[in-house]
Interface confidence: low
């Protein structure tokens, strides 16, 4: 016996969490993984006093203590449809079925004499079915439904009489199933029948407050498990050859501070107080664990010394359940302070731990819903996905020796002091009904799926690809809004005059009268942040930089009788140097944020967006830079994510919807202005770029959701890539949808009407298809009413615990970015398509491994659509060059330009062209390549103010 | 153009097995937003829906016959297949498949399109 | 399960105004579509969504729906209306289709 649990909050240092494994296991389990699911007697038998069946203590129990709840004849129904249950097991394709049976319904009063012969028959029946199914079962002696009279005769648990009652109970048991059961388990988590039948009396027979009585209860609960072990072990094991266990259950618990040994010696404590309690003396040494005895010695019962050399060692491998049971409502005691939590693999590791690395069965698992939700049950899914993905870490990882698992619970039912105010099946059912129809849950689809492939071995994404991207291929790097530098900070040479410092012992400078020196012409490099600028873009070796212009700096006033040179020269400089560097300029003209809209001072104060003279405010303005700026910059952007400007214009969906149209035609105006009167000369690209993150429906077993992601991409994209790219109209979906719930009285909005005019002059306003790509969002069908853009939709999100996410719970799914480049070239056309923003935010601020993981693997999904998929993808834009102070940070460099490291891994990216075979020599010509030229590079960072 | 068309035996016998099948062109099976019904009307009688494939492989049956229904598709055939066992006289009718859109609502917004219907006859 | 009602016959005079019944419990929640049905032919949905029309259907045919009961309303009737209407719902709960009953419009004369 070992006992070093503690050891499990000293967090392991090599954790990384880009190593997807330690979040995510794609693998699968072992070959003759057991794989069940299980029922309570009580909760889904029902027929409480049918066909001579004697009442429990929760029948009881139900009729004093539980409001609103007549018996626990409103469930399942098992008793009378045992034939639908074994369909519902026969669907999910469960290699064994845990049941328990109902003492009262084969004793009536809890003495074996004569067994209830209907009750003897309906077991039978149901063992002989598994049987013939192949499904092997595992039986619970006690669920909690002792017979009413042993508790009305000897108080129930806390008179050992009833341990030498349970005893022949249990032989009978084994005599007339014994030989079709392998695994028997003796009691169902003895914790929570001590704790809250005779401590809080949330559970029957519903005393509380006497903290010996509890105790006592705990300690018969472990004598009468023991005495039945080792009566099976002496009488019926040589035969029946099975084995037999409890099942004890837990909750886990982190410290709140993992470097404190105080938090860590409390959480210690608090599973040792749980878990321990029944663990220690079976699975332990004999005896409760120290810390028990010294804390509870009034209270705690002892065991002798024969009694402790009889307890231990009596199961034949660890029985544990880990469900909302043993979680709520968790007493303060068991918390001592510290943060509870669902980590099965901690706790799993735990018991390896503390109790030498037994065999473990987990004979519960699961959680529940509210009872509202019928056969809907997307969380549950992401629940079950969670803890099989640590059950399956800690056999793989941590080589646990997990064999089994029981999801619970096959059917709705009676849920104990929630009554029927929770759901915990992977059937539905419906109580009311007369039929008791099982309907299976997305989460039986998605145990059944599990089931089927021994885990989780469908990886989402094909395996990496070996290729390059095409020579004309643009890297880039994107930056938000430059603001422009008013005055150049390096004011040397152009003033002439000669100054003498300190001439009078007052430290200041006195021009010399009479001399005018020479001056020499502005030079870019005279704006010191423009030298920044370009010392982090020689390190990035990209071969394009976007960022965006600031209106507001541009034309302060909105229109051009007042435009800021000295401001367009910064803009020039920005593109002009880089450009001596091979560095191309895409160009964003307006790049509004949720928290700054960036609009000239008066457009703000008349409305914004929400007026439609912004749109010719903005034409202007796109015209005044294509004529500034066009003859050095061959790719713009007109504006940055409007499909986003929704946040902002968020007071009611027609006002999100007014300023999304005139955006449109802002965007439109420009283009035409370009196409008309620059395109000839200047032979640039204008498009828009969108933000454009992927949906996956959150339940791929509900159709709902299947429409929900189409949905999403139709609100978030097709809302401005229809008009533009295709139709000059708002997508028919979108429209029809917003419509249809108009019509329902669920929202007053509505989306414009177009007129001709308006469909001409947006329509083929793109000269390629620039997508903002980020993340993929699991998306969900969900009816909100409002009359704002977010309820319009009727979605909501969800966030998979399971998936690598950023600080700002980005989840990192690379197979999205080609879902969506996919999807794009099916809806609008073979298109050129540029991804003008891609990126995550990661803490690190030297080795920022995040973003590196990112970066390669999403480079890949572009790369296998580009090779595989045929998508004309011209360019990709990393997301961004530098942080800002106080945001989330995305950045390559830090705010104050420090590298970090995943700037030299785009730099191989780049130099690579992608991810090439080796030794692979597709070189590119030496005018298409983008160069290093050291001079230059050096030539940049010398020169001089 | 989108069409549907169904095809089958003429004439089954009782206990036999029936087995329809529904060739769809103009649209794809695995588009997300389009499912596929079976309706059968006996001669004289309403119309009775019998079951429903979703885009995602979701399979509906109506309650009385679910028994007897399996429903599938072979998206790369363009068709989707209807068996109903143990055919009995009383099951003689002209069966439809017809196709359902999602558009704006909240579920499929009718069936708009449907097969000119086939006429099985259940007898000995 | 869900149940709709419809009238089995509605006769009305050419030129006047038919109105079809559908009811269902609270169907004014669900969405509910109409077919026509002439004889030896396949049905053709005529409204969907309680009230829209498909593209090629005359606007004399219009919908509606609230409390407990949804109608097809027919003006200017014809001749050539005459025939078998259905109404149609999915029972969101348990994903089935339900049809009406049918009712058998008749032009007089």
């Known amino acids: 016996f070992s006992g070093d649990g503690r050891a499990i909050w000293s967090k392991n240092p090599n954790f990384t969490p880009v190593n997807e494994s330690q979040l995510f296991l794609y693998d699968t389990f072992p070959k003759n993984f057991f794989w069940g699911i299980g029922t309570g007697a009580l909760q889904v038998e029902g027929s409480w006093k049918k066909d001579g069946k004697g009442p429990s203590i929760w029948d009881h129990f139900i009729h004093t203590h539980l409001k609103n709840v007549s018996s626990t004849n409103g469930s399942s129904d098992s008793y009378i449809f045992l034939e639908k249950d074994l369909s519902a097991l026969d669907f999910i394709g469960v290699s064994f079925y845990q049941f328990s049976i109902s003492w009262p319904r084969l004793f009536p009063d809890g003495i074996v004499t004569v067994a209830n012969a209907k009750g003897l028959q309906y077991y039978s029946t149901l063992l002989d079915a598994l049987v013939l199914r192949n499904i092997e079962p595992i039986v619970t002696l006690y669920h909690w439904d002792l017979p009413l009279a042993l508790q009305e005769k000897y108080g129930g648990w806390k008179n050992d009489t009833i341990i030498d009652i349970f005893n022949d109970y249990a032989t009978y048991c084994f005599q007339m199933f014994g030989d079709r059961v392998k695994y028997w388990i003796t009691i169902h988590n003895p914790y929570l029948v001590a704790w809250h039948g005779y401590g809080t009396g949330m559970h029957a027979p519903g005393e509380k407050g006497n903290l010996a009585a509890v105790y006592t209860v705990g300690h018969n609960l472990i004598k009468a498990h023991s005495k039945v072990w080792h009566n099976y072990n002496t009488h019926f094991r040589p035969h029946q050859k099975g084995w037999l266990s409890i099942t004890l259950g837990s909750h886990w618990i982190e410290p709140n501070r993992s470097e404190n040994t105080m938090d860590i010696f409390k959480c210690q404590q608090s599973m040792v107080s749980v878990l321990g309690w029944f663990a220690n003396p079976i699975h332990g040494d004999g005896d409760y664990p120290e810390g028990m005895r010294k804390k509870l010695f009034s209270v705690l019962p002892i065991f002798s010394e024969a009694e402790k050399h009889e307890m231990r060692g009596t199961a034949d491998f660890f029985a544990f359940s880990f469900g909302p049971n043993n979680f709520k409502p968790l007493n303060t005691m068991a918390k001592m302070g510290q943060n509870v939590s669902l980590n099965l693999r901690e706790a799993l590791n735990w018991i390896k731990l503390e109790y030498n690395n037994p065999r473990i069965l987990i004979a519960e698992n699961g959680w529940f819903t509210d009872s509202r939700v019928k056969t809907e049950d997307t969380t549950a899914i992401y629940m079950m996905k969670n803890f099989l993905s640590q059950v399956l870490q800690a056999i793989r990882l941590d080589e646990i020796r997990v064999f089994g698992y029981t999801a619970w619970s096959l059917l709705d039912g009676f849920e104990w002091q929630d009554a029927y105010t929770i759901r915990r099946g992977l059937f539905y059912v419906d109580f009311n009904s007369k039929q008791k129809e099982r309907k299976p849950k997305s989460s039986a689809h998605y145990y059944k799926q599990i089931i089927r492939e021994n885990g989780f071995s469908l990886k989402e994404s094909t395996p990496d690809v070996q290729g390059q991207f095409p020579c004309d291929f643009s890297w880039g790097v994107t930056e938000s809004v430059l603001k422009p530098e008013s005055v150049a900070s390096s004011p040397q040479f152009s003033d002439p005059h000669l100054y003498v410092w300190n001439a009078t012992g007052n430290r200041l400078l006195h021009r010399v009268e009479g001399v005018r020196l020479k001056t020499r012409p502005a030079q870019c490099t005279d704006f010191v942040n423009i030298k920044k600028q370009l010392e982090m873009l020689a390190r990035m070796k990209v071969t394009h930089y976007r960022f965006a212009l600031d209106w507001a700096s541009v034309l302060p006033t909105g229109n051009l009788s007042a435009v800021n040179r000295q401001a367009l020269r910064y803009y020039r400089c920005v593109v002009s140097e880089g450009l001596k560097l091979g560095i191309s300029a895409m160009v964003t003209l307006y790049y509004p944020t949720h928290a700054h809209l960036g609009l000239p001072e008066p457009l703000l104060h008349a409305d914004g967006w929400l007026n439609p003279s912004t749109a010719e405010a903005f034409q202007a303005y796109a015209g005044l830079c294509f004529q500034e700026l066009g003859d050095l910059v061959k790719l713009w952007i007109t504006i940055n994510e409007p499909n986003r400007l929704s946040d902002i214009y968020n007071r009611s969906g027609n006002d999100t919807y007014g300023a999304a149209h005139n955006l449109l035609v802002a965007h439109a105006l420009a283009w035409r202005l370009y196409d008309r009167q620059f395109r000839p000369s200047q032979r640039g690209a204008v498009s828009l770029s969108l933000h454009a993150d992927w949906a996956e429906p959150a339940n791929p077993y509900a159709d709902s959701h299947w429409r929900a992601a189409e949905r999403f991409l139709q609100f978030e994209i097709a809302w401005f890539a229809e008009p533009l790219f295709k139709t000059g109209d708002y997508p028919a979906a979108m429209r029809e949808y917003i419509a249809s719930k108009h019509r329902r009285g669920l929202s007053s909005s509505a989306l414009p009407r177009l007129t001709e005019a308006e469909r001409r002059l947006l329509k083929g306003t793109v000269d390629f298809c620039a997508l903002n790509h980020f993340t993929t969002r699991f998306v969900m069908h969900e009816q909100l009413a409002g009359s704002r853009y977010d309820s319009d939709r009727d979605i909501q999100f969800l966030q998979d615990i399971t998936r690598l996410s950023s600080p700002t719970r980005l989840a990192v799914i690379p197979w999205g970015v080609r879902k969506l480049l996919r999807w794009v070239r099916r809806n609008y056309g073979d298109m050129d398509i540029y991804i003008t923003a891609s990126g995550i935010d990661d803490q690190a601020l030297e080795d920022d491994r995040l973003r590196k993981y990112y970066l390669g693997k999403y480079l890949q999904e572009v790369l296998k659509a580009y090779l595989i998929d045929k998508v004309r993808i011209k360019g990709y834009y990393a997301f961004k060059l530098a942080e800002e102070k106080s945001k989330p940070r995305f950045g390559f460099f830090t705010s104050d330009f420090k590298a970090k490291s995943s700037i030299q891994f785009y730099n191989k990216v780049i130099s690579s062209r992608g991810f090439p075979f080796e030794n692979s020599s597709s070189r590119c010509s030496q005018t298409q390549e983008n160069t290093e030229c050291t001079v230059c590079l050096f030539l940049v960072q010398k020169k001089p103010l | 153009q989108v069409t549907l068309k169904e095809s089958g035996p003429v004439l089954v016998k009782p206990t036999e097995t029936l087995t329809l099948t529904c060739t769809v062109s103009?649209?794809?099976?695995?588009?997300?937003?389009?499912?596929v019904s079976w309706i059968r009307q006996p001669p004289g009688k309403a119309l009775e829906w019998l079951a429903h494939?979703?885009?995602?492989?979701?399979?509906s049956y109506s309650t009385s016959l679910k028994s007897r229904l399996t429903i599938s598709k072979d998206t790369s055939k363009s068709q989707v297949v209807l068996t109903m066992t143990n055919m009995d006289p009383v099951d003689t009718a002209t069966y439809y498949c017809?196709?359902?859109?999602?558009?704006?609502?909240?579920?499929?917004?009718?069936?708009?399109?449907w097969g000119q219907g086939t006429t099985v006859t259940v007898s000995s | 399960s869900y149940v709709l009602t419809q009238p089995p016959s509605v006769s009305v005079a050419p030129g006047q105004t038919a109105r079809i019944t559908c009811g269902g419990n609270?169907?004014?929640?669900?969405?509910v579509h109409w077919y026509q049905q002439k004889p030896g032919q396949a049905p053709v949905l005529v409204v969907y969504?309680?009230?829209d029309r498909p593209s090629g259907i005359p606007e004399r045919f219009s919908g509606s729906n609230s409390g407990n009961t949804a109608t097809l309303t027919i003006s200017r009737v014809e001749a050539g209306d005459e025939a078998d209407y259905y109404c149609?719902?999915?029972?969101?709960?348990?994903?089935?289709?339900?049809f009406g009953g049918g009712t058998k419009l008749t032009v007089l004369g």
């Open positions: 017809a196709r359902s859109v999602v558009t704006g609502g909240y579920y499929y917004d009718g069936m708009d399109v």
């Open positions: 609270n169907i004014g929640s669900e969405s």
């Open positions: 103009g649209f794809s099976l695995n588009n997300a937003r389009v499912g």
């Open positions: 494939i979703f885009s995602n492989d979701e399979k």
């Open positions: 969504d309680d009230s």
């Open positions: 149609q719902v999915w029972d969101g709960e348990s994903d089935h289709v339900v």
